[in-house]
Amino acid sequence: MAVTACQGLGFVVSLIGIAGIIAATCMDQWSTQDLYNNPVTAVFNYQGLWRSCVRESSGFTECRGYFTLLGLPAMLQAVRALMIVGIVLGAIGLLVSIFALKCIRIGSMEDSAKANMTLTSGIMFIVSGLCAIAGVSVFANMLVTNFWMSTANMYTGMGGMVQTVQTRYTFGAALFVGWVAGGLTLIGGVMMCIACRGLAPEETNYKAVSYHASGHSVAYKPGGFKASTGFGSNTKNKKIYDGGARTEDEVQSYPSKHDYV
């Protein structure tokens, strides 16, 4: 029950996160004009990954797409790529996780298959979230760098008579949406990975127990399994019993807490 809840919650959290990543990627307000030095501007500028916008004194907003690909800064291209990779991985992860949900029955799908799918989707969500967080953080870093660069030469003019206020940009709403969405996707992915452990069927490792027949010193090994805790004979570790040299394979083994008969 707890596993199903964890898996379901992980799916929902990731779904919200990926929806947020998509929203952030499409939003125009990645960077917005800093109004600290010019609070009375009638022309408000803001920019997204795909276009830049200007809201004018009439209330009209004009947006223009970045119609060039080669002319754009490499960092912007990198952010675009990270966000798209995040969305693609997240979308695939969602698709996989739908089929992995314990509450959904698809044919005679085994729990082991569902566990693998849950783990796969979990990893995809984690990478998706990291991509979004990385993309947003790279853009934020770019903004901070440009902000302080433009602050250094804030005012230019002719003899100090005419002031030209250089437009500075600060964090837009999309950055916060992206950070939160990336975090949610990451958390959802971790939850899916945790759920996977609970979904995986316990490995039925039948350990052999040797029984001594009365009057005989022959060890019976039922089922043809080796009576050892290792993965094969250990000829290095020789133990001496009753003056006779026997390999560990020949030594009577007692059921440990990990052995199920």
């Epitope: 009375v40 501007t41 022309v43 200007v54 009439s58």
Partner: antibody, heavy 115, light 113 residues
Framework: EIQLQQSGPELMKPGASVRISCKAS????????MHWMKQSHVKSLEWIGY????????RYNQKFKDKATLTVDKSSTTAYMHLSSLTSEDSAVYFC????????WGQGTLVTVSA | DIVMTQSPSSLTVTAGEKVTMSCNSS????????????LTWYQQKPGQPPKLLIY???SRESGVPDRFTGSGSGTDFTLTISTVQAEDLAVYYC?????????FGAGTRLELK
């Protein structure tokens, strides 16, 4: 056809208040701010402020902050400007203007303040 | 506040003449976001509201005759009427559309000789 129709002329006593209306038609009323201007012989054209019909947000010229109050009625696509404590200095023609770059103006409302 | 200074305050011309009037702003009206100058020119005839002629310092409003041309950038702007006609006699205002409060110039009155 886009139109901004303003209310008629007003003759007011000093200290009184007046409300001027501006009825918009022919465009999406909530998509553009409604701006108000004052034109007198003394000061040419002066911007009073604007109201965003979508949410009622306003912005005023500091000079008119205590003089003018802008309101809007979305249902009738009408903007209003209330002028209080009128003095002779408030005698002027008041215009409403909207759309991009004030492409459309009302015909103007003459307010005369006289004892 | 941005101060808009228009010159001359009045112009007396004859029909067919070329007319130039200037407008200066105390601050740059250039918006770096879209590289547009937020300066607007209006024409006002007696008893009428102002009429939009030029926006973004040089873009002509639709329906405005092409004899009206706006130019300039930053703080210095010009309105040119290539061949003045009788119906052009009016007061011309420039307006700062870049910063609140929006401000207008005192106007240039165009009169016939």
């Amino acid at each position: 056809e886009i139109q901004l129709q303003q209310s008629g002329p007003e003759l007011m006593k000093p200290g009184a208040s007046v409300r001027i209306s501006c009825k918009a038609s022919g465009y999406s009323f909530t998509s553009y701010y409604m701006h108000w201007m004052k034109q007198s012989h003394v000061k040419s054209l002066e911007w009073i402020g604007y109201i965003d019909p979508f949410n009622g947000n306003t912005r005023y010229n500091q000079k008119f902050k205590d003089k003018a109050t802008l309101t809007v009625d979305k249902s009738s696509t009408t903007a209003y400007m209330h002028l209080s404590s009128l003095t002779s200095e408030d005698s002027a023609v008041y215009f409403c203007a909207s759309l991009r770059f004030f492409a459309y103006w009302g015909q103007g409302t003459l307010v005369t303040v006289s004892a | 506040d941005i101060v808009m200074t228009q010159s001359p305050s009045s112009l007396t011309v004859t029909a067919g003449e070329k007319v130039t009037m200037s407008c200066n702003s105390s601050q740059s009206l250039l918006n770096s976001g879209n590289q547009k100058n937020y300066l607007t020119w209006y024409q006002q005839k007696p008893g009428q509201p102002p009429k939009l002629l030029i926006y973004w310092a040089s873009s002509r409003e639709s329906g405005v005759p092409d004899r009206f041309t706006g130019s300039g950038s930053g703080t210095d702007f010009t309105l040119t009427i290539s061949t003045v006609q009788a119906e052009d006699l009016a007061v011309y205002y420039c307006q700062n559309d870049y910063s609140f409060p929006l401000t207008f110039g005192a106007g240039t009155r165009l009169e016939l000789k």
